[in-house]
């Protein structure tokens, strides 16, 4: 089953996905799509990177992190209820049936009038750790634990604060991460 993430209408949603490049600058193509990960590609592609850059994106979908270091987490700007659903992050590792795929479920809730709660600083709790297991064909994703009610205000605020900080590695290691090479 998919890992669940939540956001409120009008917020930016954050869907974590990471990989570790085999060597600096040795990037792997990645695609994000709306809908569960099919056998190839990403369903309806909303954003794509190649070996060098983000080479395709649609409005409201962007990468806030340093994708050159493998942070390919997706930010969806100003979400509406229509943004609810499953999203696919696919790491397109070259070779025979090497792709890694992650299904992430985004639940959009109506905006609350109450003030945002205290920010969460327990990064490993805020981002469920993912384990990938190899089998025949693309790897399946299992979760070792998740907090379905985590407030995405906390996550998007933290993501902004941590963009250039040394704590980014903590964040990276607690998301959907694969290592290449």
């Amino acid at each position: 089953s998919e890992v669940e993430y939540r956001a409120e209408v009008g917020q930016n949603a954050y869907l974590p996905c990471f990989y570790t490049p085999a060597a600096p600058g040795n990037l792997v193509p990645v695609c994000w799509g709306k809908g569960a990960c099919p056998v190839f590609e990403c369903g309806n592609v909303v954003l794509r990177t190649d070996e060098r850059d983000v080479n395709y994106w649609t409005s409201r979908y962007w990468l806030n992190g340093d994708f050159r270091k493998g942070d390919v987490s997706l930010t969806i700007e100003n979400v509406t209820l229509a943004d609810s659903g499953i999203y696919c992050c696919r790491i397109q590792i070259p070779g025979i049936m090497n792709d890694e795929k992650f299904n992430l479920k985004l639940v959009i809730k109506p905006a609350k009038v109450t003030p945002a709660p205290t920010r969460q600083r327990d990064f490993t709790a805020a981002f469920p750790r993912m384990l990938t297991t190899r089998g025949h064909g693309p790897a399946e994703t299992q979760t070792l634990g998740s907090l379905p009610d985590i407030n995405l205000t906390q996550i998007s605020t933290l993501a902004n604060e941590l963009r250039d900080s040394r704590l980014a590695n903590d964040l990276r290691d607690s998301g959907a991460t694969i290592r290449i090479g």
């Epitope: 309806n44 397109q92 070779g95 049936m97």
Partner: antibody, heavy 122, light 107 residues
Framework: EVQLVESGGGLVQPGGSLRLSCAAS????????MAWVRQAPGKGLEWVAN????????YYLDSLKSRFTISRDNAKNSLYLQMNSLRAEDTAVYYC???????????????WGQGTLVTVSS | DIQMTQSPSSLSASVGDRVTITCRAS??????LAWYQQKPGKAPKLLIY???TLAEGVPSRFSGSGSGTDFTLTISSLQPEDFATYYC?????????FGQGTKLEIK
Amino acid sequence: EVQLVESGGGLVQPGGSLRLSCAASGFTFSDYYMAWVRQAPGKGLEWVANINYDGSSTYYLDSLKSRFTISRDNAKNSLYLQMNSLRAEDTAVYYCARDVGYYGGNYGFAYWGQGTLVTVSS
Amino acid sequence: DIQMTQSPSSLSASVGDRVTITCRASDNIYSYLAWYQQKPGKAPKLLIYNAKTLAEGVPSRFSGSGSGTDFTLTISSLQPEDFATYYCQQHYGSPLTFGQGTKLEIK
């Protein structure tokens, strides 16, 4: 008009090799995944292999991946299937098919070639 | 592997009939399902992709529905040229798999 034309089929002895080709025209070849699908005489359809846009990723039916190799040459708008150690059960019509495009969305083999018959027999 | 099971295996019907063919996947394939029509000696032709989207040039009497594990192909009013074999195929898991086919014959 989209066209896929297979060639290279024929009669081959068990243990032999054959290389199938598929010439594509009428679309931007490098924007699509491509596939080979086969059909044994009087039987149903069986997927064989797929290849991504630039040939860097390939996907196979597990039982065939040690003997078959899919490849492409985007400069020549061509798809290939190298078949080694052929067996009687590989006898089939082999179809080249266009699969999903660069932006996803349409999951189905939208265009097919006319097929080329491979017969493995002594 | 995801198994695709079509029913019925064969079907006799008359011109003008409404015909339904079903396809069941052994696992959730969301909407990654295609339907093909094949006539003897010819290559298959895509009818429906993503479970319900009509392929280019396909008559509107063909329609697809379903998601998850259960899918249906409906021909609202059979025409003489519709007598053929129909296959479903999933694009969700590797390996890609087809149903065993449904042969539609003239009654």
